[in-house]
């Protein structure tokens, strides 16, 4: 059921980007936001 795996992965990615935004508000930003591919 790859659709479910994809949905879970995308949901986690969205949460990660939200956390990144909140952390950036605390830590400050050096550059314009970029997404880091691991």
């Amino acid at each position: 059921h790859s659709d479910g795996i994809f949905t879970d992965s995308y949901s986690r990615y969205r949460k990660q980007m939200a956390v990144k935004k909140y952390l950036a508000a605390v830590l400050g930003k050096r550059y314009k936001q970029r997404v880091k591919n691991k």
Partner: antibody, heavy 117, light 112 residues
């Protein structure tokens, strides 16, 4: 660019104490600053952080007893109701900015607080 | 509150060998993890940030990996100067409490 802690000394239990982190070569408007402590022979313990937005966050155990504040060139850690368990070296650290690099990270040499009767 | 569990507490390695240190977060912290080296009488020194990025000036024999709750620091071709205590630090964001951070308990690396 550097950070340096001061104010550590021998105090008796219950005495309040304020530690100061003095920064040079950069603006506190651009960096978050944290306090971390280390009891003798023990591990590192995160106390709290002051963000660039001037909002402070604390470890659950530190809330209510530790307060972080800042001026244009210093970040202070006010500690109340000190006990012998608070004996430690206290470090001030500059945090890495979002999308920053490792050169952002700075640690001071630390200042020793000894709580003893 | 976030909790970091680091294993082992102590490890011995021969010069030229490999050391692996593990760190487990109590919640999903994505890649918000750093590794530090600390020698007696000194403040910690940043080795790895964002789980796998090598800090400037750090030898390439140090590497970090992991995502979510499980993270690893690997020291390859261990040198005598790598004898130190190593700490992981995780950062989390909670809708209730906001920013939170914690260190692992530390791993002492002894080089034979």
């Amino acid at each position: 660019q550097s950070v340096e802690e001061s104010g550590g000394r021998l105090v008796t239990p219950g005495t309040p104490l304020t530690l100061t982190c003095t920064v040079s070569g950069f603006s506190l408007n651009n960096y978050a600053m944290s306090w971390v402590r280390q009891a003798p022979g023990k591990g590192l313990e995160w106390i709290g952080i002051m963000g660039v937005n001037d909002i402070t966050y604390y470890a659950s155990w530190a809330k209510g007893r530790f307060t972080i504040s800042k001026t244009s060139t210093t970040v202070d850690l006010k500690m109340t109701s000190l006990t012998t368990e608070d004996t430690a070296t206290y470090f001030c650290t500059r945090e890495i900015r979002d999308d920053g690099d490792s050169s952002d990270k700075l640690w001071g040499p630390g200042t020793l607080v000894t709580v003893s009767s | 509150a976030i909790k970091m569990t680091q294993t082992p507490s102590s490890v011995s390695a021969a010069v030229g060998g490999t050391v692996t240190i593990n760190c487990q977060a109590s919640e999903d912290i994505y890649t918000n993890l750093a590794w530090y080296q600390q020698k007696p009488g000194q403040p910690p020194n940043l080795l790895i940030y964002d789980a796998s990025d090598l800090a400037s000036g750090v030898p390439s024999r140090f590497s970090g990996s992991g995502d979510g709750t499980q993270f690893t620091l690997t020291i390859s071709a261990v040198q005598c100067e790598d004898a130190a205590t190593y700490y992981c630090q995780g950062v989390a964001w909670s809708s209730n409490t906001g920013y939170g951070s914690a260190f692992g308990g530390g791993t002492e690396v002894v080089v034979k």
